[in-house]
């Protein structure tokens, strides 16, 4: 029969696991919100055609199904920051592009872990920044929907 000490330790483990899952869910929701905010601004701006941002190629992972695949998103945050800096105008204003990207990076690292040994396998096909953001939004939504509530 299980002792009271082993029962309490397994309960504590379960609680800790639940807490981690909740945190992970929160981080995913935060990342999703940030990417959606960025896409929304880009979509509006794209309709006002000074389309330099569409000339930048972004690369997507061959397959993205796990949190470790967020390494592929982190690898492309530099070019994303460059696009934001380049497209600032009265019509497209992101008060602090540097902070915005930095916050995304922090959230990504929290989700995938700080281990950078995983090497991203990029697809051969490149995408515009708009398609790139759409793809990562779909990734977040997919992970959130399959996570245990």
């Amino acid at each position: 029969a299980p002792t009271s000490s082993s029962t309490s330790s397994s309960t504590a483990e379960a609680q800790q696991q639940q807490q981690q899952q909740q945190q992970q869910q929160q981080h995913l929701e935060q990342l999703l919100m940030d990417l959606q905010e960025l896409l929304s601004r880009m979509e509006n701006y794209r309709n006002l055609k000074l389309p330099r941002m569409l000339t930048f190629k972004f690369y997507l992972p061959k397959q993205a199904t796990e949190l470790k695949d967020l390494q592929c998103l982190e690898d492309e945050l530099g070019p994303l920051r460059h696009v934001l800096d380049l497209t600032q105008s009265k019509s497209f204003q992101l008060e602090d592009a540097e902070n915005f990207i930095s916050n995304i990076r922090v959230t990504v690292v929290k989700l995938k872990g700080s281990d950078n040994t995983f090497e991203c396998q990029f697809d051969d096909e490149s995408a515009t920044v708009v398609d790139f953001l759409r793809r990562w939004i779909a990734f977040c939504q997919s992970i959130i929907s399959t996570s245990p509530q």
Epitope: K49, T55, L86
Partner: antibody, heavy 119, light 109 residues
Framework: EVQLVESGGGLVQPGRSLRLSCAAS????????MHWVRQAPGKGLEWVAD????????YYADSVKGRFTISRDNSKTTLYLQMNSLRPEDTAVYYC????????????WGQGTLVTVSS | SYELTQPPSVSVSPGQTARITCSGD??????AYWYQQKAGQAPVLVIY???KRPSGIPETLSGSSSGTTATLTISGAQEEDEADYYC???????????FGGGTKLTVLG
């Protein structure tokens, strides 16, 4: 139907100034970035400058920076190119163009206006 | 300043496939665009974002890109394809647009 009509070209002496206009119609001008592209006689295309829909972002080719100024008047749906300190090598047909569809390419072009810089 | 390099001329027999290349250091990170210009006319966009065709452009024109080279392919070239073709992209900063020097396509009669 989208229409871009350039005007203001002509013969001008080196060192003088000229202002080109591009009258736009058939689309919501204030939504779109606009470009100037030129082509010297018998030569290739050269991008000159572009301006964002609201006029807040302007970019210039190195060959014209400091001499040419791109501007727009959204109320008049007109794009301008002020050309100062003109040189013989600025002789070209000047086109205005706009990326109208959902791409970065220049989908619509005017018929061009010829600028000749010669003494 | 940034340059896009194209061959000055390409010749093919009618019905053959013509390939026009455009090379530039920034092309792994920038999309290429292609324009067709017939004598005495304004240029026409035929390919955007490496390989997309605007509506009204025939399927005989296609684009691709690999590394520092973008390629425009004209399959089954006909006399009406005779024109100057220009590639177009932005430089390393993304701030300046640049045209290639242009390639004259001749379809040998």
């Amino acid at each position: 139907e989208v229409q871009l009509v350039e005007s203001g070209g002509g013969l001008v002496q080196p060192g003088r100034s000229l202002r080109l206009s591009c009258a736009a119609s058939g689309f919501t001008f204030s939504y779109y970035g606009m470009h100037w592209v030129r082509q010297a006689p018998g030569k290739g295309l050269e991008w000159v400058a572009d301006i964002s829909n609201d006029g807040s972002n302007k970019y210039y080719a190195d060959s014209v920076k400091g001499r040419f100024t791109i501007s727009r008047d959204n109320s008049k749906t007109t794009l301008y190119l002020q050309m100062n300190s003109l040189r013989p090598e600025d002789t070209a047909v000047y086109y205005c163009a706009t990326p109208y569809y959902d791409s970065s390419g220049l989908d619509y072009w005017g018929q061009g206006t010829l600028v000749t810089v010669s003494s | 300043s940034y340059e896009l390099t194209q061959p000055p001329s390409v010749s093919v027999s009618p019905g053959q496939t013509a390939r026009i290349t455009c090379s530039g250091d920034a092309l792994p990170k920038r999309f290429a665009y292609w324009y067709q210009q017939k004598a005495g006319q304004a240029p026409v966009l035929v390919i955007y974002e490496d390989n997309k065709r605007p509506s009204g452009i025939p399927e005989t024109l296609s684009g691709s890109s690999s590394g520092t080279t973008a390629t425009l392919t004209i399959s089954g070239a006909q006399e009406e394809d005779e024109a100057d073709y220009y590639c177009y992209s932005t430089d390393n900063t993304g701030g300046l647009w640049v045209f290639g020097g242009g390639t004259k396509l001749t379809v040998l009669g």
